[in-house]
């Protein structure tokens, strides 16, 4: 959320964020690294335009203007220099002036060899257990946020993995209203709306970053998971990858995975929602995972199929009003599953990225708590890549994506709940190899996709 | 002054392990990633892993994997190279050397001087 | 796991002269690729960061240069002192494997 730099009575006080690159006389002598010409401490620039009237409590709400609640002034970097405090380049550039293009290379976890595989469990586990080098998380609300004693920030060190649940769960939690009030819930920054692509692109992109720095590893990628397959099971649910299904329990990972230790943080929902507090780094149970085990729901208990994807790609407008979940003919929508896969609106369809969540049946199809599995990770590198196809075969025509009135958190201009430093969607509304510095090693089925006899 | 000083020469047995040792000083091991490579006698260099002794998190080289074993003591400055199951083509001279932690500078820019492990019954 | 080329394996030249040594790695690395001098039985010693950087102390003889998958060390108006081993290394992804080295002899 923040920078562990700018968690301090002076900076939450002062309302700025702008930490020193390199500071040879002293604190506040090279704020965004002004010394080198990287960037500048500059007032932060948030989205004021209106938001769709679903969203009632304006006022009440951290996440509302993000991030003046907290912060007025941040870094603002020249050219290709990025980061907290400007020392690091945009993605896909690097070197001592950020000059110099790369490109990393996103693959199917299924094609990868064995010691790719892994090398790639292994580096989320150690995600899992390393504290963000960066970021710290806040566990109160902005008007608790310096403690009992108005002199003790409320803030924690969180795993570089936890962190990138806390995040998810940030940007979909209810918005607190009071003790004894029930706490709103009709509102999600980066669900159920344009925002929905670019908001977990960037999330992404993120984790991605932190974990090439964890092991130094600049070629380092997330690779996805191609759930388009029509099965009714989870191809990438064995030891060697994402855990394979416990035989003394069916609703645990065996005990073989990794991922069999890991424990969930963000399940506390119910204190958050009557007491007010934050998710801490707090862990507690279990993953849960059932894939296609919901008896209840048969639509669920199978994943989507491949011409379901070749499907949403035709489907030309990025977005449709109401913007929402509701929206007909929205390539986000249909993508995001609230849409059939040609773009129909249908309140009783789960398609594609919702599909692919529901299926898993556990801890991965709950939406405060879905990164915890972190099939998530790849369950979303996929998703991206469907969005990638998309802005490479419509030019990124961002036309479609509203300037105002979207749901809260969703306008064009809004900066994305709750990533430091401020970044918009229109940011991460741009084809990924020619911007960001990745790109997928995919081929996509063709509408008249069939099963050889 | 940067410097790592590493433990003196090792002669062991086959089968046995042996832990050396590098002591650092003129900078504070938190701030680095400390690696370790091997040269075998008259041959090239070869990467063995690295630690990061702020977390003591590690990363090795596959044919590492399993003989190999780093470990860091931040009170003391000091960062460890265990290795088992020796055999003669263990012999070899090991390296300590440290990376900017900012993982964007591509370069070991301090090396210990060595230490001689010999394998042999 | 990216492989790397070191070429010539060992070459010999005169005081003075202009020699390269070259590494191919087996993928795109860009830039991340480090080259360093050993003396006989003394530690590898850092030359050259980011393919063309050089390390601080390091005469201005020495140059790096290249991309993608081609890199080269130049050494000009060569000295005596010059002799030794060359590695180069990448740091592009996991393993950070070593080039075999080239043999320098000063004539």
């Known amino acids: 959320q923040f920078p562990r730099q700018c968690a301090t009575v002076e900076a939450l006080r002062s309302g700025m964020c702008c930490p020193d690159l390199s500071p040879v006389s002293g604190p506040g002598t090279d704020r965004c690294g002004s010394s080198s010409g990287r960037g500048r401490c500059e007032a932060v620039t948030a989205d004021s335009r209106p938001h769709s009237p679903q969203y009632p409590h304006d006022g009440r709400d951290d996440r509302e203007v993000w991030p003046l609640r907290f912060f007025n002034r941040t870094c603002h970097c020249n050219g290709n220099f990025s980061g907290h405090n400007c020392g690091t380049c945009r993605p896909g550039w690097r070197g001592a002036a950020c000059d110099q293009r790369v490109l990393i290379v996103r693959r199917n976890l299924l094609d990868l060899s064995k010691e790719e595989k892994n090398h790639f469990v292994r580096a989320l586990d150690m995600a899992k257990r390393t504290t963000h080098p960066l970021f710290v998380i806040a566990t109160r609300r902005s008007e608790e946020i310096l403690g009992p004693d108005g002199n003790t920030p409320q803030f924690e060190n969180i795993s570089i993995y936890n962190y990138f649940v806390w995040t998810h769960y940030y940007s979909v939690k209810k918005t607190f209203l009071g003790v004894g009030q029930e706490s709103f819930g009709e509102v999600d920054f980066s669900h159920e709306g344009p925002a929905f692509l670019t908001w977990h692109r960037y999330h992404l992109l993120r984790l991605e970053k932190d974990m090439q720095e964890m092991l130094q590893e600049p070629s380092f990628s997330l690779p996805y998971w191609n759930f388009a397959t029509g099965k009714n099971v989870c191809d990438i649910c064995t030891d060697d990858l994402m855990g394979s299904r416990s035989n003394f329990d069916s609703t645990l990972i065996s005990p073989n995975s990794v991922f069999s230790q890991w424990r969930v943080v963000c399940d506390s929902l119910e204190d958050y929602d009557t007491l007010g507090t934050l998710c801490n780094s707090t862990e507690d149970g279990p993953i849960r995972r059932n894939p296609a085990g919901n008896v209840a729901r048969p639509m669920v208990q199978r994943l989507p199929e491949p011409q379901d994807v070749a499907q949403c790609l035709e489907v030309g407008l990025f977005d449709t009003p109401p913007f929402y979940s509701n929206s007909t003919n929205s390539f986000r929508n249909t993508v995001e599953g609230y849409s059939d896969p040609t773009g129909k609106y249908d309140p009783a369809v789960r398609s594609l990225h919702n599909l692919a969540h529901l299926f898993l049946n556990g801890t991965g199809g709950q939406t405060h708590l879905s990164p915890n599995d972190p099939i998530f990770v790849l369950l979303h590198t996929f998703t991206d890549a469907v969005f990638d196809e998309w802005l490479r075969r419509y030019n990124a025509d961002i036309s479609t994506f509203p300037l105002e009135n979207a749901p809260i958190g969703h306008n064009r201009q809004y900066n994305m709940v709750p990533f430091w430093p401020p970044v918009t969607n229109t940011e991460m509304f741009v084809t990924a190899p020619d911007n960001l510095g990745y790109t997928y090693e995919i081929q996509w089925p063709s509408r008249e996709f069939s099963v050889p006899e | 002054e940067v410097q790592l000083q590493q433990s003196g020469a090792e002669l062991v047995r086959p089968g046995a392990l042996v832990k050396l040792s590098c002591k650092t000083s003129g900078f504070n091991i938190k701030d680095y990633f400390l690696h370790w490579v091997r040269q075998r006698p008259d041959q090239g260099l070869e990467w063995i892993g690295w630690?990061?002794?702020?977390?003591?998190?590690?990363v090795y080289d596959p044919k590492f994997q399993g003989t190999a074993s780093l470990t860091a003591d931040t009170s003391s400055n000091t960062v460890y190279l265990q290795l088992s199951g020796l055999t003669s083509e263990d012999t070899a001279v090991y390296f300590c050397?440290?990376?900017?932690?900012?993982?964007?500078?591509?370069?070991?820019?301090?090396w210990g001087q060595g230490t001689t492990v010999t394998v042999s019954s | 796991d990216i492989q790397m080329s070191q070429s010539p394996a060992s070459l010999s030249a005169s005081v003075g002269e202009t020699v390269t040594i070259t590494c191919r790695a087996s993928?795109?690395?860009?830039?991340?690729l480090a080259w360093y001098q050993q003396k006989q039985g003394k530690s590898p010693h850092l030359l050259v960061y980011?393919?063309?950087t050089l390390a601080d102390g390091v005469p201005s003889r020495f140059s790096g240069s290249g991309s993608g998958t081609q890199y080269s060390l130049k050494i000009s108006s060569l000295q005596t002192e010059d002799s030794g081993n060359y590695y180069c290394q990448h740091f592009w992804s996991l393993p950070f494997t070593f080039g075999s080295g080239t043999k320098l002899e000063i004539k």
């Open positions: 993928g795109n690395i860009y830039n991340y």
């Open positions: 050397t440290r990376r900017d932690y900012t993982y964007e500078k591509a370069a070991l820019d301090y």
């Open positions: 980011d393919a063309k």
């Open positions: 630690i990061n002794p702020d977390n003591g998190n590690t």
